[in-house]
Structures are given as C-alpha cells and as structure tokens.
C-alpha cells in the first residue's frame, strides 16, 4: 500500500483539507470520492458540482482538495483511489465539530428569598459533540446535573443547578460556562442573583461619644437597618414600659434629653420588610452625675480618677428571636 491519507477534524463553517498522498509513483490516476462514493475529483477534474471543493494541489504524488464552509452533512469517510494494478484505496474521516448555537440561562425566579432553594437551568443547543456545562457562583464552582438530548447527530445539553440562596448572594453572578472542542476561549452566559432578606438591625450610640450616660446628659441613638427590600418601617419602642415623655423620635433616631434614673430600661429598634422583621435592643443605665470635690485649704493635691467603659454589643437578628445590645459599665 503506497496511498496515504489523514483524518480531518474541522469546525462547522470552516475549511477542511483532504489530501491523498502517493509514495513511489511516476504518474497516477488518483480519484477522491465522497461518502456516497461519488467522484469529487478525478485527477484535476471535478465531476461533482459542489463548488465548495477546490483543488489545492495535483501532482503524480498528491491530490489535495479543500472543502469550504463545511457542514455536518459533509461528515463521513472520503475515499482516495489509486488506479494501479491492483487498485488501491484508502480513506480519511472528516469529523465536523459544531459549537453550541445558543447558550441560554433561565432562573426559576427573578427574585428569591434568603434560605430558599431555586432552580437555575442552562441550555447549550445543537452542538457536536455534546457540550460540557460548568457552573460558577461568583468565583466558586458548583455542581449541576446535565441531561443530553440527541437529534440528528446534534446534541442539546441542559444542566440544572439547585441553589440555596443566602443574603450574601444578592448581586452575585451565576455563570453558565461551556467547554467544547469547537469553542476557543470562554463561552459563557450569566444572570445576577436578586436575593431578598429580612433586615439586619444595628443600634449605634451617636451621643455621648464616650458611651457613659449620666443624669442630666442627653442620649442619641441611631438605628441602622439594612435589608432587601429596604425596610419600610423602623420604629423605636421601650420594652415593658412607655417611652419617656421627653424622648424625641425622628426617623431612625431616638433622642432623650436630660436623662434621669426613670429612663433606665431596654430600648428596642424594630425594622421590617416583606421578608420578615428583626430588632435590636439597647439597655440604658443612667449613672449619677459626677461629684465635685472642693479645693483643699492648705495642701494642693490632684487626684485623677480614670473610669474605663467597655461597650459590649451582642447582635442577633434571627427571625422570631430576641436580639440584645447591652452596654455595661465597669
């Protein structure tokens, strides 16, 4: 056998080159046949009307033909025939790769609630061979479940991802990425998650700055509530008691002027949205006003008393459970 061919792999729409090579030949009748065993080229003549076939080279040792705009229907065995005695035949297989035509991502819900499990589907249509689908949430790879449907030598792959969403996932992209021999670089599509979550409530003492509340002083607390959607209602209440008469409520702020011991208690900021409600507590303890020491008559001694105030804040915004902020003065 002195007739040689090589298999060809080509991407749909691109150019395949078929070569029939002859070793040790003075002159020869080389013929190239298609999978239907029709003559494409007989030496340098093309009986086949398909003008996508063009002669690249014809000599006594080679018949080289290009096939442009390759389609899936061109796939198969192409035969090189050499009219010697006895005749020789060799075949080359053209394999056509088809990149996925469409990449579609579909999220079961446009908006999900934290803790909910949502279904995300990604479909890579009509590829050959079947596409491999990979999932990412941000930079983290996740595992999906793929189903392959075959139709007329083409494959449609649908991958399903079950995703339990958390509030941190809001605004994070879910990426469907395909891997396919006909695709160079990254072919991907993505959707951004929209996750609704109940408020997170945090109380901040904006006055006094040093955190020590004494009789006669003023107190200003600011309630910060973050949620999605943004909390519609932020309210202040005094736990197990009425709000002091001299307390002033202004949006998320609570002002109490001229503090006295009767103001002691737990002040709660409550916030809610369509997902749920949460609160945070501030325990107020009003200290005595500072005592004034009269100046000594004979000896001048300066005594400095340092009071250390440790403010411990404990937050818990789980639904239906008490959250507390305690300020403890040591």
């Amino acid at each position: 056998q002195n007739l040689f061919t090589k298999d060809v792999t080509v991407i749909e729409g691109e150019v395949a080159t078929i070569s029939c090579q002859v070793n040790k030949s003075d002159d020869s009748v080389i013929q190239l046949l298609n999978p239907n065993r029709q003559t494409i080229y007989f030496r340098d003549f093309r009986p086949l009307k398909d003008s996508r076939f063009q002669l690249l080279n014809f000599s006594s040792s080679e018949l080289k033909v290009s096939l442009t705009n390759v389609s899936i229907s061109d796939e198969g065995r192409y035969f090189c025939q050499l009219y010697t005695d006895p005749p020789q035949e060799s075949y080359t297989t053209i394999t056509v790769l088809v990149p996925p035509r469409n990449l579609m991502i579909d999220i079961q819900k446009d908006t999900a609630v934290e803790g909910e499990e949502i279904e995300v589907n990604c479909t890579a249509m009509a590829s050959k061979p079947a596409t491999t689908i990979r999932w990412f949430k941000g930079n983290t790879e996740l595992k999906g479940k793929s189903e392959v449907e075959e139709w007329s030598d083409m494959y449609t792959v649908t991958s399903q991802l079950m995703l339990k969403v958390h509030k941190e996932d809001d605004g994070v992209p879910v990426i469907c990425q395909v891997e396919h021999p006909a695709v160079t670089g990254n072919l991907q599509t993505q959707r951004y998650l929209e996750v609704q979550y109940k408020p997170q409530v945090h109380i901040q003492m904006t006055y006094p700055l040093q955190g020590l509340t004494r009789e006669g002083d003023a107190l200003e607390l600011t309630c910060e509530a973050i949620g999605k959607p943004q909390p519609v209602m932020v309210t202040w209440v005094r736990v197990d008691d009425e709000m002091p008469q001299h307390a002033v409520l202004s949006g998320p702020n609570l002002f109490i002027n001229n503090l006295n011991k009767t103001d002691n208690g737990t002040y709660r900021c409550e916030a809610s949205n369509i997902v749920g409600k949460a609160h945070s507590d501030y325990m107020l303890y009003v200290y005595d006003p500072p005592t004034t020491i009269p100046p000594p008559t004979t000896t001048t001694t300066t005594t400095t008393t340092t009071t250390t105030t440790i403010l411990t804040i404990i937050t818990d915004s789980r639904a239906g459970e008490e959250g507390s902020i305690r300020a403890v003065d040591h």
Epitope: S28, Q38, T39, F42, F45, P47, L48, K49
Partner: antibody
C-alpha cells in the same frame, strides 16, 4: 484546427490481435488526456480506455480490462490501442477523443 | 452496472421544441455532457457542464440538470438536428458513463 485520425481497423479472427492508431494534430498533444470510445453496430457509445498526458497511468472499462492496452507516443503525437484476445462482441467502430475537463471535446472519424 | 437511461426515441415537428431526458441516481449532483451523432458521422459535443455550449453550437441547444434528471432542450428544431443524442456523466465513481442514447426524428 484540432484533428484526430484513426487507423488500423480491420477484420480479425476471434482470439486475434489488432493495433489501432490515432494521429493527433492542431493542439499540444502531450498536454491532454486521451480516450478510446467504441460503438457496436446499431448500438450506443461505450468508453473503452483512458490515458494521462504523460502516458504513465491508464484506465480501462471492465469489459476490456486485461485484454486491451492503451499507450501514447508524445513525440509522434499518436495514441494507440493494442487489442488482444479479441471477441465477437468487440466488433465496433473505435473512436479516439481528446479529453478536456472530463469531457470529450474532439473526436476522430472512427475506424471499424 | 451503472446506467444513464434515455428514452429510445423522441419525435418533434420542425420549429417545435424537443426535450431529451437522461436519468440516473443523484445525477443532478454531477456535471452532464451531451453529444450529437448524425448518421454515419462521429459524435460532437453540444453541451458540457449541464448547460454550457462549446463554440460553434447554436443557441437553440440548451441543457439543465437537477435531482435525478438532466434534460437537453432543442428549441425551434430543424431537419439538420435529426440525430442520435447521448448524455454522459460520472456515475458514482465510474468515469465516462454514456446514456443509452435517444434518436430524435424531425417529422
């Protein structure tokens, strides 16, 4: 003007031999593929044999394979058909023809 | 055996159109040539590559080829067009296959 002139036809006994010639003129003979085509009395055309321009490769119809030999002498602008082991069914007018892009664009007048 | 099938005969009145068919499996995918052979003469190429005319062939000769059938059309037929007509094509991988031939009679 392209001209092809066959000669060498005649009467021969079954099993006998005959050599046909085709003298070409009016074109560069060495650049063209050539064929022999025959036509039995009252019948249609039948391709018999084919030869490449250099003479280095040939092709035959199954009906004559192993019995007929096509050859050419480019220095003499002549095409030949050596016919051996002749049979009654080989009786026909033999035409030589020039091949251009797979078609027979010029034919000789034939020899019987 | 590979074959290109033609009707044995076609009759046409002078000035009318004669249509000669040539049938073969997937014939429309390959180029077809047509040859005219007048009585006692050698064949002459009248159509190649389905519908092209060599120089010197009158415009009344035209060809078409699709599906499994090629057609040679002679418009405004004259007495001088009376002849045998042969189609020729590559049939599969078999080269130089001739049709069975059609005798055209101008009435």
């Amino acid at each position: 003007e392209v001209q092809l002139l066959e000669s060498g036809g005649g009467l021969v006994q079954p099993g006998g031999s005959l050599r046909l010639s085709c003298a070409a003129s009016g074109f560069t003979f060495s650049k063209y593929e050539m064929v022999w085509v025959r036509q039995a009395p009252g019948k249609g055309l039948e391709w018999v044999s084919y030869i490449v321009p250099s003479g280095g490769a040939t092709l035959y119809a199954d009906s004559v394979k192993g019995r007929f030999t096509i050859s050419r002498d480019n220095s003499k602008n002549t095409l030949y058909l050596q016919m051996n082991s002749l049979r009654a069914e080989d009786t026909a007018v033999y035409y030589c023809a020039r091949v251009k892009a797979g078609v027979f664009d010029y034919w000789g007048q034939g020899t019987l | 055996q590979y074959e290109l099938t033609q009707p044995p005969s076609v009759s046409v009145s002078p000035g009318q159109t004669a249509r000669i068919t040539c049938s073969g499996d997937r014939l429309g995918e390959t180029y077809v040539s047509w040859y005219q052979q007048k009585p006692g003469q050698s064949p002459v190429l009248v159509i190649f590559e389905d519908n092209k005319r060599p120089s010197g062939i009158p415009e009344r000769f035209s060809g078409s080829n699709s599906g499994n059938t090629a057609t040679l059309t002679v418009s405004g037929t004259r007495a001088m067009d009376e002849a045998d007509y042969y189609c020729q094509a590559w049939v599969g991988s078999t080269p130089f296959v001739f049709g069975t031939g059609t005798k055209v009679t101008v009435l």
